[in-house]
């Protein structure tokens, strides 16, 4: 037989790892193998996820927790819980339909996963571009060519000394 | 190491009392691992006492045979579980056994400590 | 749930292949494991979840089953093998837990 020590709802004293077993007199029957339960009072025990094929286990199952899945390497997990694996590329590269692709001019993608983006346009914030962009790296903005004209400085001069006791005019 | 250690044993008069301790050691008690009682008397088979609930409640599962007279409890800060036996018979001696049982073995006893031999005679 | 198992004991010699069955009195599933135990010795796990080799565990034996009837089967059986076996239900509460009554393989 089994003793619990509960006079309400039998079923709330069963512990995680365990599930209140109706078949047998609402007794708190561990979770049996490859299943679990995450919380006390369950009336049933939860299948444990299987890391298989493109997914690996990143951590184990136990009676009290799933399993945790990631990716093999050339993979990449997406989706809540790593629900999918998706392909990785190369930098430089996007996953189309048809596979890795590489980045059109004018893009890049510095990753293994997600798409190319637009390199940054410096003109849209008054900047010039001081290094040119590839499919693997976004340019580099640098100061504005007005700031680069002969002569300018691009120091800015230090606010002149005030005496104490004076108030700027 | 991971290991399981029994103590307590010895000769007891019929009616008295016994206290066995199993002491774990190199992993600890859990949901994933109960501690159990099994004992064998001499030239005879394996019988089933009972196990507890690895983690902090205190769910016991009992062989209906033991009718109250044995009591299996635990501590989880000495990571032991003990055995109390009372109104002790003829028939309960045998070599006592300390198991785990383990979620990761289908909850079978993957795990055992040496046994301690329980002799009860007048 | 009671256990039993037959025979109760067997001879054999070293090469023969072995069988021992266990019953349980209600289904269990698929929750028994089989244990070897030598004299003066603790058991040792063998098979769980009724078919699944423990670790460590040759892969001569093997265990199958589901439901009430449940089989260990030694393919080959070698000198260390001679021992006692015994099933154990794994269906925690309601005495779930009980053992077989053992099976004995002596040399012939």
């Known amino acids: 037989f089994e003793r619990t020590r509960s006079l309400q709802d039998p079923c709330s004293n069963c512990p995680a790892g365990t599930f209140c077993d109706n078949n047998r007199n609402q007794i708190c029957s561990p979770c049996p193998p490859n299943s679990f339960s995450s919380a006390g009072g369950q009336r049933t025990c939860d299948i444990c996820r299987q890391c298989k094929g493109v997914f690996r286990t990143r951590k184990e199952c136990s009676s009290t927790s799933n399993a945790e899945c990631d990716c093999t390497p050339g993979f990449h997990c997406l989706g809540a819980g790593c629900s999918m694996c998706e392909q990785d590329c190369k930098q430089g590269q996007e996953l189309t339909k048809k596979g890795c692709k590489d980045c059109c001019f004018g893009t890049f993608n510095d990753q293994k996963r997600g798409i190319c983006r637009p390199w940054t346009n410096c003109s849209l914030d008054g900047k010039s571009v001081l290094v040119n962009g590839t499919k693997e790296r976004d340019v580099v903005c640098g100061p504005s060519p007005a700031d680069l004209s002969p002569g300018a400085s691009s120091v800015t001069p230090p606010a002149p000394a005030r005496e104490p006791g004076h108030s700027p005019q | 190491e991971v290991q399981l250690v029994e103590s307590g044993g010895g000769l007891v008069q019929p009616g008295g009392s016994l206290r066995l301790s199993c002491a774990a050691s190199?992993?600890?008690?859990?949901?994933?691992?109960?501690p159990c009682w099994v004992r064998q008397a001499p030239g005879k088979g394996l019988e089933w006492i009972g196990c507890?609930?690895?983690?902090?409640?205190?769910?016991?599962y009992d062989a209906q045979w033991t009718k109250g007279r044995f009591t299996i409890s635990r501590d989880n800060s000495k990571n032991t579980v003990y055995l109390q036996m009372n109104s002790l018979r003829a028939e309960d001696t045998a070599v006592y056994y300390c198991?785990?049982?383990?979620?990761?073995?289908?909850?079978?006893?993957?795990?055992w400590g040496q046994g301690t031999l329980v002799t009860v005679s007048s | 749930i009671q256990m039993t198992q037959s025979p109760s004991s067997l001879s054999a010699s070293v090469g023969d292949r072995v069988t021992i069955t266990c019953q349980a009195s209600?289904?269990?599933?698929?929750?028994l494991a089989w244990y070897q135990q030598k004299p003066g010795k603790a058991p040792k796990l063998l098979i769980y979840?009724?078919?699944t080799l423990a670790s460590g565990v040759p892969s001569r034996f093997s265990g199958s089953g589901s439901g009430t009837d449940f089989t260990l089967t030694i393919s080959s059986l070698q000198p260390e093998d001679f021992a006692t076996y015994y099933c154990?239900?794994?269906?925690?509460?309601?005495?779930?837990?009980?053992f077989g009554t053992g099976t004995k393989v002596t040399v012939l």
């Open positions: 198991a785990r049982s383990a979620w990761y073995s289908g909850w079978g006893g993957d795990l």
């Open positions: 209600q289904s269990i599933s698929n929750r």
């Open positions: 979840s009724a078919s």
């Open positions: 154990q239900s794994t269906y925690y509460g309601n005495d779930g837990n009980a």
């Open positions: 190199g992993f600890s008690f859990s949901a994933n691992y109960y």
């Open positions: 507890i609930y690895g983690g902090s409640s205190d769910i016991t």
